[in-house]
């Protein structure tokens, strides 16, 4: 047996293996407080006790131990704000991206025993405590019930609930996926006085049906009511109950605008601004025009008044209203003004101060970069991020705005903190914002730390990932730039990323990999060590990911490019780039794919269809194929509705199989799975049948009864071994 | 052009019932927005909102003093709301006013003519 050589410490680091990524090896860890008060908090540590910290007193102690949560296998929990009881959560079964069902156990603290009588029914779909005290609110089967107290008898609030009819404090397919983004309908006002809710009515929507095989004798039908472009959408009424006498008056229903209500409309938002007052945001079907609207109870009447003069309309002349969402407002203290981000007339997003009218609103922030999420608003100061610093469009950086200055004054938290390691933040604020927490997602290692909210000064490094600092030291990581190029007028950054012993002389792979949905964003500057990182280390391949036309916080005249032409310019652009890099002269141009998953399957597709000759080889995962097959929130966003008099002409001319001859060329891998409730697999059946009747070859691979995401284990194991297998045929690499 | 008119007032005996309508033109009382409520006035006395219905939610409300006694209710389809008045004291004797009230504006609200409930024997 040979002697082993001795290597010098420069040659002894390793290229990534697709193992490492599969087994989550090189995966990090953020640290985000659960805020009980404004120097409070609760985090579950990693042997699973839910420990209680105070940042004043630096006391810490085991709040509830892992032998109770482990008692009823909980993997989750939720302290009532009297601090008295805690819910456990178990029995997590995953329905759509947010929506889930659990079982639920109440937790004494005071007595150290689980509260018997009147226990919860299983499964339920949503469950809450008030924002005072200890009630709870939850939903089962599709209606919304009350507890006074965690021991006492529930009231039942809504009857109307349906499965698959009727959806009560719960959103419908729609409207958890394209719209709220979340698995709720149900808000408490702050003093828990009274519970706003939302009902979905979906009688009039048609059905996706598709099998679920499981390992019975015959597949099931998973039914899922399910609005595509143009079809019937859910009804929605949103009511408010008192819930210190819930029968006594029963739900109050609260009023659409009439500007909405005369055609057919969303509902988009609701956020309370007082104990007796609350602000909802609707939209028109046709998604250019929002309307917020402020409501106040009435004690006389006991009703709710949403008066026209308290109606504020957001309007798009170049494309859709909002960003991705329409932006929600952050009220003052005043309960009557509000700061919100919305387009100014430059057509870049930014934060403005509504008093009165939108006609009259304050901008806030300017320039040719954007505001892009309000934290918060307290009485002195307003917290946000945006893509300001250093013109970098995939940064997030954290800003304080002193509003108690005239004029007002403004502050990068974030900019210098780490300005290596850290170009991309979020932060986690604490009542009233006396603390918060950043998290960095990058472009170097992950940190989480703690920091005062009067002076933002650093009290604790809450995570640092050191142990993924240490294991990460003898692994080759590819090196990633991010950078711009331009063609004509036009501006697209870029990430690139480069196998390690990257010679600019030399001529290697590459592989495009694309999102390019719009609003989306893949140029950011986070840090990742996943599939492309692993192809990038080991196999020499390199990566770029192009953020074109249609993409967000670049200012409306980019994103809204897109607008009623999906499929058009994000391919365009991403050609244009393809072009550029061979430029460079590092590429070789023979051995050029493409590959994308969801709206990056449609593109990827699209840019192989493109007759180019550009690329060799390319992979849809999951692609949609016609906007006609998808959600009609998302659809006519972006297209307007099918219709001859709309623009049914572009959906039919924007479609994967209208394009099917062009494959002829390329080496096309087809992947999706059964079970996709959200790109159903009528998609890549649909261009299947197209490339089978142009008499087209391609590969194709499907997940049996696996998700939009095809997340099981094996399945990721077989999707990337399966993917990997068929880049390094096209690119001619040994195995 | 929005008309309120109620009818049902009467004399009736104390123990007994009566059940006042209101039939409203000019606006939908299904609307969301639309809230109708009895309110009575007898003199001496002031102003009470005896019960208020928003029939889109079926959500009622009622002065504590005819709580269990009166309930208001209505039938979209004849866009008419109601008040069944029951086990009647003299103390309800009143002028009774449907009032149409608007969620989207309440600095107005619609009246009736009112009808006059008189409870004596």
């Known amino acids: 047996r040979p002697s082993r050589v001795y290597k010098p410490e420069g040659n002894t680091k390793r290229a990534l293996t697709l193992k490492d990524i599969l087994n989550g090896t090189f995966s990090y860890k953020t640290y985000f407080p659960n805020w009980i008060s404004e120097q409070e908090y609760l985090h579950q540590s990693e042997d699973d006790n839910i420990v209680f910290y105070n940042i004043e007193t630096r006391e810490s102690y085991i709040i509830l131990s892992n032998s109770t949560m482990k008692s009823v296998n909980a993997t989750d929990y939720g302290l009532s704000p009297d601090r008295q009881f805690v819910y456990l959560e178990s029995d997590y079964s995953k329905l759509w991206r947010y929506s889930y069902t659990a079982t639920y156990y109440i937790y004494d603290l005071q007595n150290g025993e689980f509260v018997r009588g009147y226990e919860l029914p299983r499964p339920i779909q949503y469950l809450c405590w008030s924002p005072v005290g200890s009630k709870l609110a939850y939903v089962y089967q599709n209606n919304i019930y009350l507890k006074q107290r965690p021991g006492d008898p529930p009231f039942q609030i809504t009857y109307t609930g349906r499965e698959n009819r009727i959806f009560n404090g719960i959103p419908d397919w729609v409207y958890e996926e394209e719209m709220l983004a979340t698995k709720y309908a149900l808000w408490w006002s702050p003093d828990g006085k009274f519970l706003a809710y939302v009902e979905f009515n979906d009688s009039d929507i048609p059905i996706i049906a598709y099998s679920y095989y499981g390992d019975g004798q015959y597949p099931r039908t998973i039914n899922i009511p399910y609005p595509k472009a143009g079809a019937k959408n859910p009804v929605v009424r949103v009511f408010i109950v008192d819930t210190t006498y819930p029968h006594h008056v029963g739900p109050m229903e609260v009023p659409v605008p009439e500007m909405i209500a005369s055609s057919d409309y969303y509902f988009s938002w609701l956020t309370w601004v007082s104990s007796e007052r609350v602000c909802l945001q609707w939209l028109k079907r046709v998604q250019n025009v929002s309307v917020l609207s402020i409501c106040d109870f009435r004690e006389d009447w006991h009703a709710w008044e949403c008066p026209k003069n308290q109606e504020h309309v957001e309007e798009s002349r170049t494309g859709w209203a909002g960003g991705f969402f329409v932006s929600t407002p952050a009220f003052s203290q005043d309960a009557t003004s509000y700061y919100k981000i919305f387009s100014d007339k430059d057509g870049y997003k930014h934060i403005h101060y509504i008093k009165d009218t939108v006609e009259n609103a304050i901008q806030i922030t300017s320039g040719k970069w954007e505001a892009i999420y309000i934290f918060r608003v307290t009485q002195d100061s307003l917290f946000y991020s945006s893509n300001e610093f250093e013109g970098y469009p995939g940064r997030r950086n954290i800003y304080r705005i002193s509003i108690g200055n005239s004029p007002p004054s403004k502050k990068c938290v974030t900019c210098h903190l780490r300005k290596e390691r850290c170009q991309y933040y979020t932060a986690s604020f604490s009542y009233k914002a006396k603390y918060y927490a950043l998290v960095c997602y990058g472009p170097g290692l992950p940190i989480s730390t703690l920091h005062d909210g009067r002076t933002d000064q650093e009290i604790q490094v809450l995570e640092e990932n050191k142990e993924l600092e240490n294991s990460l030291r003898n692994i080759q990581l590819p090196k990633v730039e991010i950078k711009k190029l331009k063609d004509g007028g036009l501006t697209f950054w870029y990430k690139m990323i480069l196998p390690p012993q990257f010679d600019r002389s030399k001529k290697y792979p590459l592989l495009i990999q694309v999102y390019g949905g719009p609003c989306s964003q893949s140029v950011k500057s986070v840090f990742a060590v996943n599939w492309i990182t692993y192809l990038a280390s080991k196999e020499g391949i390199v990566i770029a990911l192009v953020d074109g036309r249609g993409t967000a916080f670049q200012g409306d005249k980019f994103l809204h490019a897109v607008y009623r032409k999906l499929g058009v310019y994000e391919v365009e652009d991403q050609l244009t780039a393809v072009r550029k890099f061979i430029e460079m002269g590092f590429i070789d141009e023979e051995r050029i794919a493409i590959w994308g998953w969801s709206y990056g399957g449609y593109v990827s597709s699209l840019a192989l269809a493109s007759g180019t000759g550009l690329f060799k080889c390319g992979i849809a995962v999951a692609p949609v194929s016609s906007w006609e097959y998808y959600a009609s929130i998302y659809s006519e966003r972006f297209m307007g509705l099918p219709t001859k008099d709309d623009n049914l002409e572009h959906y039919k001319n924007s479609t994967v199989m209208a394009r099917a001859e062009y494959f002829r060329n390329v080496d096309y891998l087809l992947i999706h799975g059964t079970a996709d409730d959200n790109v159903h697999f009528q998609n890549s059946a649909q261009i299947a049948k197209a490339l089978v009747n142009a008499q087209v070859d391609f590969q194709a691979m499907w997940y049996s009864d696996q998700n939009h995401g095809i997340l099981s284990g094996r399945s990721q194991n077989h999707l990337y071994t399966h993917m990997t297998h068929f880049l390094k045929q096209c690119f001619s690499l040994s195995d | 052009e929005v008309q309120l008119v109620e009818s049902g007032g009467g004399l009736v005996q104390p123990g007994g019932s009566l059940r006042l309508s209101c039939a409203a033109s000019?606006?939908?009382?299904?609307?969301?927005?639309?809230?109708i409520g009895w309110v009575r006035r007898a003199p001496g006395k002031e102003e009470e909102l005896v019960a208020r219905i928003q029939c889109s939610a079926g959500s009622t409300r009622y002065a504590d003093s005819v709580k269990g006694r009166f309930t208001i209710s209505c039938d979209t389809s004849k866009n008419t709301a109601y008040l069944q008045m029951n086990s009647l004291r003299a103390e309800d004797t009143a002028v009774y006013y449907c009032?149409?009230?608007?969620?989207?504006?309440?600095?107005?609200?619609?009246w009736g003519q009112g009808t006059t409930v008189t409870v004596s024997s």
């Open positions: 009032a149409g009230r608007s969620a989207r504006s309440y600095s107005y609200i619609y």
């Open positions: 000019g606006f939908n009382i299904k609307d969301s927005s639309t809230y």
